[in-house]
């Protein structure tokens, strides 16, 4: 089970209308450039076999991957939203740095790996898709971690 006290984000992180709006605007702009609507990264398969108490830990992994492998490499795109949203998400990632799981997290890593593989397989369009799903990442992170 997770060390649940550390796998928590304060509700106030998600009660900032400006940055919430900017995150959703960024997602909307990127989704307009996403021509692969058949694939969804953040959906049922990602959470398959993951208990309620493990959801935040899973979302932490997804957030870190999205920052490091998607947002940082694409940081020059989708301005001015990107320059505001990336530091916000990085702060959330930092606040979850002590969120760990005691015991086996193989099932979680397997699910996250599938998401990573999908993004990598699609190349740049996979990265655009991930940015286009930042609204889902934001909401899923909120729902899992508050």
């Amino acid at each position: 089970a997770p060390i649940s006290s550390h796998c928590r984000l304060d509700k106030s992180n998600f009660q900032q209308p400006y940055i919430t709006n900017r995150t959703f605007m960024l997602a909307k702009e990127a989704s307009l450039a996403d021509n692969n609507t058949d694939v969804r990264l953040i959906g049922e398969k990602l959470f398959h076999g993951v208990s309620m108490s493990e959801r935040c830990y899973l979302m932490k992994q997804v957030l870190n991957f999205t920052l490091e492998e998607v947002l940082f490499p694409q940081s020059d795109r989708f301005q001015p939203y990107m320059q505001e949203v990336v530091p916000f998400l990085a702060r959330l990632s930092n606040r979850l740095s002590t969120c760990h799981i005691e015991g086996d997290d193989l099932h979680i890593q397997r699910n996250v790996q599938k998401l990573k593989d999908t993004v990598k397989k699609l190349g740049e369009s996979g990265e655009i898709k991930a940015i286009g799903e930042l609204d889902l990442l934001f909401m899923s992170l909120r729902n899992a971690c508050i």
Partner: antibody
Framework: QSVEESGGRLVTPGTPLTLTCTVS????????MIWVRQAPGEGLEWIGI?????STYYASWAKGRFTISRTSTTVDLKITSPTTGDTATYFC?????????????WGPGTLVTVSS | AVVLTQTASPVSAPVGGTVTIKCQAS??????LAWYQQKPGQPPKLLIY???TLASGVPSRFKGSGSGTEFTLTISDLECADAATYYC??????????????FGGGTEVVVK
């Protein structure tokens, strides 16, 4: 992938009753399951949920009145001491978390009538 | 606990027409709202989640919108088969788990 409830019947007040939800086509080790009830002519009312790891959570009004448990293929709802107000159709449904909880599919329901 | 208030029943419209059902939440639930359709003698059926995402197999005549506290389900090109009661359902996270899932009171749609 389907769920089906059974065990509903006419009982007298105070007589414990256990309803069973049988699942097929998916594993209870991968999905949480919820119980919802609907009194005749009324709306839907969430009772409780059993998570993948066996943890249970109940609506505030349902605590102490209901107990949810499971085996590898079934989820049970025990009505500990039924009253006439517990007369309803009881549904179970699979909880699919997609970043938010959604309930699908639902069983056809089983009718419980509590009367003296 | 969040309270969901739906459009009063019944709402009626002719075949081929459009109906709009509103669902108002007593607190901000972001986009954590789903819509279910229930026909007499049947269980509820998932229509929409994330406030606007169509569930698999649901016709595009069904459209969900809204966020925060105001949500709408619109059914266009009404068919006789759309006659049913529609429920909104919210997920509220971060509070006690004993009030996480809430249903609205339901709105009956009559197709003339």
């Amino acid at each position: 992938q389907s769920v089906e409830e059974s065990g509903g019947r006419l009982v007298t007040p105070g007589t414990p009753l256990t309803l069973t939800c049988t699942v097929s086509g998916f594993s209870l080790s991968s999905y949480a399951m919820i119980w919802v009830r609907q009194a005749p002519g009324e709306g839907l009312e969430w009772i409780g949920i059993i998570d993948i790891d066996g943890s249970t959570y109940y609506a505030s009004w349902a605590k102490g009145r209901f107990t949810i448990s499971r085996t590898s293929t079934t989820v049970d709802l025990k009505i500990t001491s039924p009253t006439t107000g517990d007369t309803a159709t009881y549904f179970c449904a699979r909880d699919r978390f997609v970043g938010v909880d959604i309930f699908d599919p639902w069983g056809p329901g089983t009718l419980v009538t509590v009367s003296s | 606990a969040v309270v969901l208030t739906q459009t009063a029943s019944p709402v009626s419209a002719p075949v081929g027409g459009t109906v709009t059902i509103k669902c108002q939440a007593s607190e901000d639930i972001y986009t954590n709202l789903a819509w279910y359709q229930q026909k007499p003698g049947q269980p509820p059926k998932l229509l929409i989640y994330w406030a606007s995402t169509l569930a698999s197999g649901v016709p595009s005549r069904f459209k969900g919108s809204g966020s925060g506290t105001e949500f709408t389900l619109t059914i266009s090109d009404l068919e006789c088969a759309d006659a049913a009661t529609y429920y909104c359902q919210a997920c509220v996270y971060g509070n006690s788990a004993d009030s996480r899932y809430t249903f609205g009171g339901g709105t009956e749609v009559v197709v003339k």
